[in-house]
Amino acid sequence: GITIPRNPGCPNSEDKNFPRTVMVNLNIHNRNTNTNPKRSSDYYNRSTSPWNLHRNEDPERYPSVIWEAKCRHLGCINADGNVDYHMNSVPIQQEILVLRREPPHCPNSFRLEKILVSVGCTCVTPIVHHVA
Amino acid sequence: GITIPRNPGCPNSEDKNFPRTVMVNLNIHNRNTNTNPKRSSDYYNRSTSPWNLHRNEDPERYPSVIWEAKCRHLGCINADGNVDYHMNSVPIQQEILVLRREPPHCPNSFRLEKILVSVGCTCVTPIVHHVA
């Protein structure tokens, strides 16, 4: 990896697990006030592979609210508005980092967690399953 | 919001900015070893709105590597394999949390940052702008 010269103004860490446990400032830097994906764009409705957004809430996690996409159909919407089953609506998934309270219910102690979320759907040519 | 009873086993915080500054364990909990989205699925290639994945690396950020999707076409691929400009390929974006080293180059001090990433592309019916 890239070696970064250490800044002499860094906080000291007396934690025996250093650098596994770090200090994190929760004042979000690049904050974007638009947290509801339904407001950010209407792609979920205009897509040929439309999706619904489900609210997933967990007070033990930061962020506590995550929106999960679920494709509406097996196929994709064609020009006539019908579902074309020669194509497939599939979820686009992404691994994201969240903070999990650890020990549970602690306000100031977290552990990084990777979770897989479905962000939206896309229309793909299917892999045809042949009968054995 | 939901009030969580505090666990008596929580670490104490003497930080005057508490609870803004918290301790985070970087041992990722639900780790998924497959970090290269190209390996996780070939949707980016099979989609009617295909995309390329660009590696975005920043040693001052955790995770340091993030993959960004860029739609290959303005239109969508039709059944004949041609680009249909009556439809639009658009990026599906998601706000994600990352850790930004703060002060810079510090190994054990971070600030939460929200960034907007393009995860993949979807094919949408365009909004037609009529001339007044």
Partner: antibody, heavy 115, light 113 residues
Framework: QVQLVQSGAEVKKPGASVKVSCKAS????????MHWVRQAPGQGLEWMGV????????NYNQKFKGRVTMTRDTSISTAYMELSRLRSDDTAVYYC????????WGQGTLVTVSS | EIVMTQSPGTLSLSPGERATLSCKSS????????????LAWYQQKPGQAPRLLIY???TRESGIPDRFSGSGSGTDFTLTISRLEPEDFAVYYC?????????FGQGTKVEIK
């Protein structure tokens, strides 16, 4: 003309599995998806899932997830619906229906689950 | 999942009368991008499979008499039979095709008064 002919009535014991077939004729089988719908005696209709006869991909009603399997054999233009771990409340007439909105339906297969 | 509610449960009418059946969904079935409502109506007679009458809320399936008409948008839909014929006495179901699972209403029985 389009025809969907389903297999005959079945009597099964709780815990067993049943596989219902739906043979299609009068059209190109892989051009239309096949939906499966059931109807308990004196009750309404319940959508179980759909199979793309072209790709074999499926979408199941979560209620039946883990118990239902939909397959097809394109060489004989036949769709299948298998329901496992049968319970008495699975007693129903099971229908296959062609296309987006069920423009054509099979005659139905009565499955009775009884000990 | 989307919940479909039909009313009334039973409709008692005479041949020649007008029948108005209602179907309400727990969320909008209108896809704003193509302005289509993903709702279908079916007729079922005793011992028979259902028969498709209407799709996209108002499009009549081929071969369906024009006395059957569908209307409505969003969450409120209506099936109208302008003049009841003896063969129209049956159970009618609405079904949403907006999002899986594609749920049905509980049905409205149109019986002879």
């Amino acid at each position: 003309q389009v025809q969907l002919v389903q297999s005959g009535a079945e009597v099964k014991k709780p815990g067993a599995s049943v596989k219902v077939s739906c043979k299609a004729s009068g059209y190109t089988f892989t051009d239309y998806a096949m939906h499966w719908v059931r109807q308990a005696p004196g009750q309404g209709l319940e959508w179980m899932g759909v199979i793309s006869t072209y790709s074999g991909n499926t979408n199941y009603n979560q209620k039946f997830k883990g118990r239902v399997t939909m397959t097809r054999d394109t060489s004989i233009s036949t769709a299948y619906m298998e329901l496992s771990r049968l319970r008495s409340d699975d007693t129903a007439v099971y229908y296959c229906a062609r296309g987006n909105y069920g423009s054509d339906w099979g005659q139905g297969t009565l499955v009775t689950v009884s000990s | 999942e989307i919940v479909m509610t039909q009313s009334p449960g039973t409709l008692s009418l005479s041949p020649g009368e007008r029948a108005t059946l209602s179907c309400k969904s727990s969320q909008s079935l209108l896809n704003s991008s193509n302005q289509k409502n993903y709702l279908a109506w079916y007729q079922q007679k005793p011992g028979q499979a259902p028969r498709l009458l209407i799709y996209f809320a108002s499009t009549r399936e081929s071969g369906i008499p024009d006395r059957f008409s569908g209307s409505g948008s969003g969450t409120d839909f209506t099936l109208t039979i302008s003049r009841l014929e003896p063969e129209d006495f049956a159970v009618y179901y609405c079904q949403q095709h907006y999002s899986t699972p594609y749920t049905f209403g509980q049905g409205t029985k149109v019986e002879i008064k």
